[in-house]
């Protein structure tokens, strides 16, 4: 569950469930910082613009990140 705020982390709960890359509008990877000591991954879905916080430690999510970056590298000239 994402919450917006200035300081502190954004994700309140995280999901281990993989997301279909085709249903993704946007995938944000927020590196650890002085505001939040952990990496946060926020997926925005095409349907309704729903947001989901993903577990960076989950194998399924790591595979998703690989798939997305592979897709991006294919698209870039």
């Amino acid at each position: 569950v994402p919450l917006s705020r200035t300081v502190r982390c954004t994700c309140i709960s995280i999901s281990n469930q993989p997301v279909n890359p085709r249903s993704l509008e946007k995938l944000e990877i927020i590196p650890a910082s002085q505001f939040c000591p952990r990496v946060e991954i926020i997926a925005t879905m095409k349907k309704k613009g729903e947001k989901r916080c993903l577990n960076p430690e989950s194998k399924a999510i790591k595979n998703l990140l690989k798939a997305v970056s592979k897709e991006r590298s294919k698209r870039s000239p």
Epitope: V1, L3, R5, I12, S13
Partner: antibody, heavy 121, light 109 residues
Framework: QVQLVESGGGVVQPGRSLRLSCAAS????????MHWVRQAPGKGLEWVAL????????YYADSVKGRFTISRDNSKNTLYLQMNSLRAEDTAVYYC??????????????WGQGTTVTVSS | EIVLTQSPGTLSLSPGERATLSCRAS???????LAWYQQKPGQAPRLLIY???SRATGIPDRFSGSGSGTDFTLTISRLEPEDFAVYYC??????????FGPGTKVDIK
């Protein structure tokens, strides 16, 4: 099955302290934000506090800020509510509830049975 | 802080009738962040609707939610005996507190 069981309620004098516990089972507790919600006798629901899945984020209702502390022990699958400087108006049934972990906000999808706190002299 | 108002306070209906419950917010709430709960005497609340219009797991299709902005509605198309209870709306905005409405009691006429 997915379950939350609260304990620690009882009768306590005004100004004293009490610690509530909520034991979770049947789901990945360490992935889930957790809430405390209370209900005074004959009244509606009042959100009390929220803690993020890893304990970094804590939020409180104004009515309990500075007096109550929410915490968790993911190794024990347990949520806590430390209640200090208790007042008569804190008398209520206290529920712990799970913040739906899949996706954006889907509500509090799992609730405990509640534990009763009575503040009286 | 967003304040939620529910109306009516009590709704007296017979089994088989349609129930329409209203929840109004003091300021706009993203429909992604509006939920409805049912509570029966002596029991914990139960999540019915999330995201203003999506039914939670195991909730019968006679329950439906709608609305956006400041006005939201919970509709029970045909009341069953087990539907007589108190219903609460709740908002979960971009920051706490995550307020509940005062509730609507649906009782038997």
């Amino acid at each position: 099955q997915v379950q939350l069981v609260e304990s620690g309620g009882g009768v306590v004098q005004p100004g004293r302290s009490l610690r509530l516990s909520c034991a979770a089972s049947g789901f990945t507790f360490s992935n889930s934000g957790m809430h405390w919600v209370r209900q005074a006798p004959g009244k509606g629901l009042e959100w009390v506090a929220l803690i993020g899945f890893d304990g970094i984020n804590e939020y409180y209702a104004d009515s309990v800020k500075g007096r109550f502390t929410i915490s968790r022990d993911n190794s024990k699958n347990t949520l806590y509510l430390q209640m200090n400087s208790l007042r008569a108006e804190d008398t209520a049934v206290y529920y712990c509830a799970r913040d739906w972990p899949e996706g954006y906000y889907n509500g509090m999808d799992v609730w405990g049975q509640g534990t009763t706190v009575t503040v009286s002299s | 802080e967003i304040v939620l108002t529910q109306s009516p306070g009590t709704l007296s209906l017979s089994p088989g009738e349609r129930a329409t419950l209203s929840c109004r917010a003091s300021q706009s709430v993203s429909s992604s962040y509006l939920a409805w709960y049912q509570q029966k005497p002596g029991q914990a609340p139960r999540l019915l609707i999330y995201g203003a219009s999506s039914r939670a797991t195991g909730i019968p299709d006679r329950f439906s939610g709608s609305g956006s902005g400041t006005d939201f509605t919970l509709t029970i198309s045909r009341l069953e005996p087990e539907d007589f209870a108190v219903y609460y709306c709740q908002q979960y905005g971009s920051s706490p507190p995550f307020t509940f409405g005062p509730g609507t009691k649906v009782d038997i006429k």
